[in-house]
Amino acid sequence: EKLPKAPVITTPLETVDALVEEVATFMCAVESYPQPEISWTRNKILIKLFDTRYSIRENGQLLTILSVEDSDDGIYCCIANNGVGGAVESCGALQVKMKPKITRPPINVKIIEGLKAVLPCTTMGNPKPSVSWIKGDNALRENSRIAVLESGSLRIHNVQKEDAGQYRCVAKNSLGTAYSKLVKLEVEVFARILRAPESHNVTFGSFVTLRCTAIGIPVPTISWIENGNAVSSGSIQESVKDRVIDSRLQLFITKPGLYTCIATNKHGEKFSTAKAAATVSIAEWSKSQKDSQGYCAQYRGEVCDAVLAKDALVFFNTSYRDPEDAQELLIHTAWNELKAVSPLCRPAAEALLCNHLFQECSPGVVPTPMPICREYCLAVKELFCAKEWQAMEGKAHRGLYRSGMHLLPVPECSKLPSMHRDPTACTRLPYLDYKKENITTFPSITSSRPSADIPNLPASTSSFAVSPAYSMT
């Protein structure tokens, strides 16, 4: 009969290298009597006999990992014990070798110029793969802005337009190489105005072209704003070349305005905008009427048909390229403005404006416009439209107009001839005479002017009913 013998491990465990999904075997040869009981641990945790991932054979002396996973690496020990003497142990490492694998590949990125971009590239592999990057067809060189992080991710500081392109990461170790798919880095650039529109001071009826050039990625859109609202008239021509948009707004100038060019582009859910403004001012209408040349002809427009005396000849100012058209458009613009004034003021203002813009004309050797009589002008200003006129003058002092009579080509009453001096030198407004017959009272008005300036129309021919403040003496 054999003598009892304590276990001795005759083949110590060694380090085993294994590829993922391959078989790995540890051998633990033991000499002892009686036959020992052999158990296995991984990282000091007992491996259960019924774990189907393992096969334990040869009385426990052979441990086989049937399909190695990357999580199987660690220290494997066999422990032999037969009750004679102490248990013996031998340990060896399992090094799971792994071809490179990209576990978190890069994705398409849109980034705004100047910000930091990070393209991820997380890898697995044993030996640990080295990560490099390719841009387009060339290996990407690191520099002060561009670095490959320890994690494998690509970090680009202060992204520039030239950083845009297609990128892929490459993971490499002794067992192989893995490539990510190509991803696109798009560099977006905030809209920026390269050329702002220029301000103009022009005569009424002129054509003006405002030009605005902007750049950005994506290419910006350009919109135009007139005095805070979308431009209602004029034609816009646009062209795009090399990410630069050129917008030209052609305007037929009938009123002063602040024109703003707004360049906008979209970055995800956010927009970037750039603005530039220009003013278009009009050389004063009354000045352009002075010393003006023109011709007398019948009015054939639409707006003043019902207001002007039938078959009267009116003055057309040839300082305009197309006098008929320019004056008609000005009166059309003026009438639109009059929508905002009171029912008392509007017809009187219409009569004043039509007769001021289309002055009666004496077709002599030198065609001569006949201005409105001062008294009628003052009647409109200080009686029919007193409230509107005051509001307009207040706005004029503040330098900005919004609505009402501010854009109207109204005459300066004080500079008009008086019908008391020469009744044939000026034009009367029949509408105001007609009102005398139909209106008995007017709202009381406190005049801001001395009483000497108050209109004083002869009752017999051309007068109108007035409030007590306007005596008809």
């Epitope: 002809a297 019948q298 054939r300 639409e302 019902a306 000849l313 197309d322 008609e328 059309h332």
Partner: antibody, heavy 121, light 113 residues
Framework: ELQLVESGGGLVQPGGSLRLSCAAS????????MSWVRQAPGKGLEWVSA????????YYKESVKGRFTISRDNAKKTLYLQMNSLKSEDTAVYYC??????????????WGQGTLVTVSS | QAVVTQEPSLSVSPGGTVTLTCGLS?????????PDWYQQTPGQAPRALIY???SRHSGVPSRFSGSISGNKAALTITGAQPEDEADYYC?????????????FGGGTKLTVL
């Protein structure tokens, strides 16, 4: 290039209706007055109707008043002439013409090639 | 309704000068009638020559000029060319208010012999 192209002409019986259209291109349509002018076979020109830039007024030759309606759609850059109760004397080539300015009346500085309207039983 | 009158036909030698006139059956033509002149060659649409008495449309040769002479509007061709052979129409603006009218004359057939 400025173009005016008329369409909608054809043969119609007396008392019938036609709608002529004039498609404009190559200029800012809503900055100009427009007119319809007709020319009977072998005859002279005859103004029919006019409309200013904004469509705010309409004007007609006395003989077509109440039967013809001029209109414009500035968004579509199109001028129209709706002709009802047509008579044999309305037979003509109908020209669409552009004014040199905004108001309805004045020189017609661009013309279409015309569309023939024949009123016959 | 006023009738606009024109010479039915006129002839001119190449290089010669010819004046076409445009009158009113009742009254005189004035600048308030804004006389306009058109040229039409066979099978073609009319072409604007002169507007508002004496203004030439763009592209119109300087040999064409307009005026008011006496009580009529006039179109003068100075140094006529063979290509000037055509029908010439004058048109006058009439009326006010809703009675505005634009009346063409019967046309003048110009022959360049």
């Amino acid at each position: 290039e400025l173009q005016l192209v008329e369409s909608g002409g054809g043969l119609v019986q007396p008392g019938g209706s036609l709608r002529l259209s004039c498609a404009a291109s190559g200029f800012t349509f809503d900055d100009y007055g427009m007119s319809w002018v007709r020319q009977a076979p072998g005859k002279g020109l005859e103004w029919v109707s006019a409309i200013p830039w904004n469509g705010g007024s309409t004007y007609y030759k006395e003989s077509v008043k109440g039967r013809f309606t001029i209109s414009r759609d500035n968004a579509k850059k199109t001028l129209y002439l709706q002709m009802n109760s047509l008579k044999s004397e309305d037979t003509a080539v109908y020209y669409c013409a552009k004014r040199s300015g905004r108001i309805a009346f004045g020189a017609l500085d661009a013309w279409g090639q015309g569309t023939l309207v024949t009123v016959s039983s | 309704q006023a009738v606009v009158t024109q010479e039915p036909s006129l002839s001119v030698s190449p290089g010669g000068t010819v004046t076409l006139t445009c009158g009113l059956s009742s009254g005189s033509v004035t600048s308030s009638n804004y006389p306009d002149w058109y040229q039409q060659t066979p099978g073609q649409a009319p072409r604007a020559l002169i507007y508002s008495t004496n203004s030439r449309h763009s592209g119109v040769p300087s040999r064409f000029s307009g005026s008011i002479s006496g009580n009529k509007a006039a179109l003068t061709i100075t140094g006529a060319q063979p290509e000037d052979e055509a029908d010439y129409y004058c048109a006058l603006y009439m009326g006010r208010g809703s009675n505005k009218d634009y009346v063409f004359g019967g046309g003048t057939k110009l022959t360049v012999l």
